[in-house]
């Protein structure tokens, strides 16, 4: 025997109090699948959360975070404080990256500078709290007498023929 509730579409619920007829989900609730015996409560995007998508009778609300905070967890379940570049979030708040580490984003942790010497390269640009070091050619490539990469010939200007 077919369950009469299976005929209830998304956006409704099978109302046991009314002979299992399909009743619309009440305000602030939704059912995303058919055959539901109850509707789920809509999530409220309040305070630090902002509404990205309103709740409808067939789908839950979706939230994001107010400026200065970013989403964490599935479905933006939490909002974490942004820090500045060059900082990381600790239990005591935003703290500057320690020497030798950097963070080029407003979230996440400070990461160690790249160790150029591990790849046999030299440091071309020093690292900062906000930026990783830039590794250059290996020290051997820079020693006197070592063959260097020939720079490309300058492009000829139009209207000039070669001498």
């Amino acid at each position: 025997l077919q369950d009469p509730c299976s005929n209830c579409p998304a956006g409704t619920f099978c109302d046991n109090n009314r002979n299992q007829i399909c009743s619309p989900c009440p305000p602030n609730s939704f059912s995303s699948a058919g055959g539901q015996r109850t509707c789920d409560i809509c999530r409220q995007c309040k305070g630090v959360f902002r509404t990205r998508k309103e709740c409808s009778s067939t789908s839950n609300a979706e939230c994001d975070c107010t400026p200065g905070f970013h989403c964490l967890g599935a479905g933006c379940s939490m909002c974490e404080q942004d820090c500045k570049q060059g900082q990381e979030l600790t239990k005591k708040g935003c703290k500057d990256c320690c020497f030798g580490t950097f963070n080029d984003q407003k979230r996440g942790i400070c990461r160690p500078w790249t160790n150029c010497s591990l790849d046999g390269k030299s440091v071309l640009v020093n690292g900062t709290k906000e930026r990783d070091v830039v590794c250059g050619p290996s020290p051997a490539d820079l020693s006197p007498g070592a063959s260097s990469v020939t720079p490309p010939a300058p492009a000829r200007e139009p209207g000039h023929s070669p001498q």
Partner: antibody
């Protein structure tokens, strides 16, 4: 299960600053709002303000100029400071945990009575 | 003066059904869900109903909540002497960006 415990002086002099701390035990402070509510003798409940675990705050406009709420996640505590108090600030002060997705206060401290008097 | 309006008192006899009303506006009850709290003398309020009509575990099904437009109500059926308490409605207010409360209804169980 999560429990909240308010602590702080029960007597504060007029014009001074009322300071209370709420200690959260049996659970994490992360992922929730944490509010301060007060109830003057024989009167209504009044929301003072809330702090989200990651530092977002909002205060009742009627008290905003005098209120600061802060959180210390490393100690699982949040605190209330109310400056320039008068006798009208005499009340039972409650701290609460507020669900962040559906906004209801599901855990309350037992309350602490603060009297403002010289 | 509270943002949400409740009658100051209500009463009923054991076994009766009583309802407590809560009236608000479009910025609170009209656009958000309603919660109800129960408070006994000398103790902290306790969550009784959340999201209009949801009962936390441990709350008897004699307690039910509903909402229509900018008003909400709490119904208590099969009234018992231990239901004598203060009942507060509350909800989020979008203009405040925070919660608002009613001033409470003192429920007396007669006889």
């Amino acid at each position: 299960q999560v429990q909240l415990q308010e602590s702080g002086p029960g007597l504060v002099k007029p014009s001074e600053t009322l300071s209370l701390t709420c200690t959260v035990s049996g659970g994490s402070i992360s992922g929730y709002y944490w509010s301060w509510i007060r109830q003057p003798p024989g009167k209504c409940l009044e929301w003072i303000g809330y702090i989200y675990y990651s530092g977002f705050t909002n205060y009742n406009p009627s008290l905003k100029s005098r209120v600061t709420i802060s959180v210390d996640t490393s100690k699982n505590q949040f605190s209330l400071k109310l400056s320039s108090v008068t006798a009208a600030d005499t009340a039972v002060y409650y701290c609460t945990r507020d669900h962040s997705h559906y906004y209801y206060m599901d855990v309350w401290g037992q309350g602490t009575t603060v009297t403002v008097s010289s | 003066q509270s943002v949400l309006t409740q009658p100051p008192s209500a009463s009923g006899t054991p076994g009766q059904r009583v309802t407590i009303s809560c009236s608000g506006s479009s910025s609170n009850i009209g656009s958000n869900t309603v919660n109800w709290y129960q408070q006994f003398p000398g103790t902290a309020p306790k969550l009784l109903i959340y999201s209009n009509n949801q009962r936390p575990s441990g709350v008897p099904d004699r307690f039910s909540g509903s909402k229509s437009g900018t008003s909400a109500s709490l119904a208590i059926s099969g009234l018992q002497s231990e239901d004598e308490a203060d009942y507060y409605c509350a909800g989020w207010d979008d203009s405040l960006n925070g919660p608002v409360f009613g001033c409470g209804t003192k429920l007396t169980v007669l006889g």
